[in-house]
Interface confidence: medium
Amino acid sequence: SIPWNLERIIPAWHQTEEDRSPDGSSQVEVYLLDTSIQGAHREIEGRVTITDFNSVPEEDGTRFHRQASKCDSHGTHLAGVVSGRDAGVAKGTSLHSLRVLNCQGKGTVSGTLIGLEFIRKSQLIQPSGPLVVLLPLAGGYSRILNAACRHLARTGVVLVAAAGNFRDDACLYSPASAPEVITVGATNAQDQPVTLGTLGTNFGRCVDLFAPGKDIIGASSDCSTCFMSQSGTSQAAAHVAGIVARMLSREPTLTLAELRQRLIHFSTKDVINMAWFPEDQQVLTPNLVATLPPSTHETGGQLLCRTVWSAHSGPTRTATATARCAPEEELLSCSSFSRSGRRRGDWIEAIGGQQVCKALNAFGGEGVYAVARCCLVPRANCSIHNTPAARAGLETHVHCHQKDHVLTGCSFHWEVEDLSVRRQPALRSRRQPGQCVGHQAASVYASCCHAPGLECKIKEHGISGPSEQVTVACEAGWTLTGCNVLPGASLTLGAYSVDNLCVARVHDTARADRTSGEATVAAAICCRSRPSAKASWVQ
Amino acid sequence: QDEDGDYEELMLALPSQEDGLADEAAHVATATFRRCSKEAWRLPGTYIVVLMEETQRLQIEQTAHRLQTRAARRGYVIKVLHIFYDLFPGFLVKMSSDLLGLALKLPHVEYIEEDSFVFAQ
């Protein structure tokens, strides 16, 4: 038997396998920004370099005395979780420790920034193989700490951060809220969110995925053969840093976007009980527990997508929400969601050379979310086609008119504030393949892409009876790229993607006043990438 | 994920009336001051001055030096603790909060963030 956490994240077929880079050497280096560590511990001895970097505040209290084993406790444990020879995820990975937390586990934003700069300097002085930076710390939201993470990520460094142990929205903390870091929440042996006293793991749209973070056995700094159990999102982040190190060890050229997409795609889905999270955060929090993915050679050229939620727009009449993909990803579709149902839709626009997903609040609305579907599409060429709103009573049709371009997503944006005019047209013409069909007063946006072997199809599911939501899933081998509520019943809350499932949400009150003829339809656009084939639309 | 969270942003765009320095009076601050929303986590007196992305190495040093000079004219001693060149242009400074208005009006300054605590998780 092995510890539960290792069993959980490393599938059986990986257990004995050694991860080696193509040239036979494992040159991945993990930088740990934490407390001091006990480098002589048998778990990490010989694989850890304790740098001379030290940027910590003074300990509080006049009676505080530094006890080496206490000072080293947090960092030693995490170093062991990442690369410990018995209890580590990426056994044998080289680790460099930078001291940015004092003996009480406290540091500063400035000290962390100087630590990140130290890593960048090291990288410039002596370029090496892939670098992973583990940030098992959190403070309040910091624009500069997030910016520094962004700059470092753009140099090819992979940053992994703890979501935070405050039982709160991770977006309120840094570096957890930085989009360029892989932010990790904590789960226990039952795959449930970790409770820590009165608090627990953070959650929300800034969390990328969860990993084991409760009662994790690892190196204890009390003696060089001692082990201890610790809990927290630091431990969870250390697991993901170890997974990333193993992925990079096998395939050193994987980019941050590829790593994140693969972590999400191969994670264990829907095992977390979402009721633990506040109601307004449940839809935003990923139900994903990390596992070590197979190599790309084993899985072929799958189309990988993830859902990115914007921040809440706020309630003002013209409030907009913006969701962005990572620079390497393609924005294949954009939808929106509002708890009150008062929204004026969504669209894709270019800002500073990057396509972004926007959503607009409506008068009397409590605010909206923009929901972007961000995908890795090699050699893609995507564009947006839009048609202004049609005259009353008419539908608007938009299709991809460029040769070999396929429809990957549709967006609808209403110019009018009056929600009552946005009813389903009395007669809806049969949708033509590869078209977005709008309705009264709606501007329609079609996301059209050309990529080698990309093929897409629409899958719809309608429910006439009372239902809070309608779902439609893409079948195995296909990936959900677009998700919409079709013109639909009065007052839909919007639509969003959860893994390969398209969810269309309907307002409770809308269920009562709907006539039997008005079906709420969830429309999914499902695509796959078959590198040998030509781009095509599947009917 | 990139929007500012529960975060304090204060505009200190006060034109200088303290002395007749032409270049200073001409430059009205568009930079913002930011600090942690959790008061207990703040470290007043230490500030990260973040400069515009394209600021050159020499300009970073000049800006830090200019702040020291102008603070000295007002009878304040400030200490530049660190200069950031490699990840972003900026510097870490220990100074009185009285000087924030002055610092925000310096050329090249994009924003100033008060230092704050981070914690092991």
Epitope: S1, I2, P3, A40, R42, E45, K70, S73, D86, A87, I217, S220, D222, C223, S224, T225, C226, F227, M228, S229, Q230, S231 | -
Partner: antibody
Framework: QVQLVQSGAEVKKPGSSVKVSCKAS????????ISWVRQAPGQGLEWMGG????????NYAQKFQGRVTITADESTSTAYMELSSLRSEDTAVYYC????????????????????????WGQGTLVTVSS | DIQMTQSPSSLSASVGDRVTITCRAS??????LNWYQQKPGKAPKLLIY???TLQSGVPSRFSGSGSGTDFTLTISSLQPEDFAVYYC????????FGQGTKVEIK
């Protein structure tokens, strides 16, 4: 008091493998780790490796890595040591020994001290490797 | 690996003598050291653990001291049953034993 009873003496050919068992009685088997220590004729003691119940995995001395496998069967309270690719230098008395692993609370966490302190020993098993 | 060096490798003493055996570690091991006694044809027996703590059932004439790299086992008044081989063993890293000290009758 835990008693450790080992399997009987073995004579093996070079290149073959040997598997020695060690059965515990009295006390809880899984709450303590088992190590294997050998002693060549007229020589000192040499630790080969041990089972760590906290991690549920075995640790091996560098010298024996890849050649020794230590396992434990909780249902029968028995530990095993298998040594492969035997050579004449492996002729020795092989002892199993219970080592301590103590759990204490510290800084609000549990610390497991993996004390390689051998208080109970088996009677020893002589393995002779000869062609 | 941490090397343990015992001295002397053998000594001759009489009943009632005070006997001291030393053990030196190749690097600091705090107080992670145990002492064992082994008689011919028998398994070793734990005498002292953690450098200086007497194992229950062991006579009080046995004592241990030291920390870091230098350790000492002392038998305050040698008894006939104490003639045996004594081993030190560190557990700060993977366990390693000293080469042994044989205490013989003079």
């Amino acid at each position: 008091q835990v008693q450790l009873v080992q399997s009987g003496a073995e004579v093996k050919k070079p290149g073959s493998s040997v598997k020695v068992s060690c059965k515990a009685s009295g006390g809880t088997f899984n709450s303590h780790a088992i190590s294997w220590v050998r002693q060549a004729p007229g020589q000192g003691l040499e630790w080969m490796g041990g089972i760590n119940p906290i991690l549920g995995i075995a640790n091996y001395a560098q010298k024996f890595q890849g050649r020794v496998t230590i396992t434990a069967d909780e249902s029968t309270s028995t530990a095993y040591m298998e040594l492969s690719s035997l050579r004449s230098e492996d002729t020795a008395v092989y002892y199993c020994a219970r080592h301590y692993e103590i759990q204490i609370g510290r800084y609000g966490m549990n610390v497991y001290y993996l004390m390689y302190r051998f208080a109970s020993w088996g009677q020893g098993t002589l393995v002779t490797v000869s062609s | 690996d941490i090397q343990m060096t015992q001295s002397p490798s053998s000594l001759s003493a009489s009943v009632g003598d005070r006997v001291t055996i030393t053990c030196r570690a190749s690097q600091g091991i705090r107080s992670a050291l145990n002492w064992y006694q082994q008689k011919p044809g028998k398994a070793p027996k734990l005498l002292i653990y953690n450098g200086s703590t007497l194992q229950s059932g062991v006579p009080s004439r046995f004592s241990g001291s030291g920390s870091g790299t230098d350790f000492t086992l002392t038998i305050s008044s040698l008894q006939p049953e104490d003639f045996a081989v004594y081993y030190c063993q560190q557990f700060d890293g993977d366990p390693t034993f000293g080469q042994g000290t044989k205490v013989e009758i003079k």
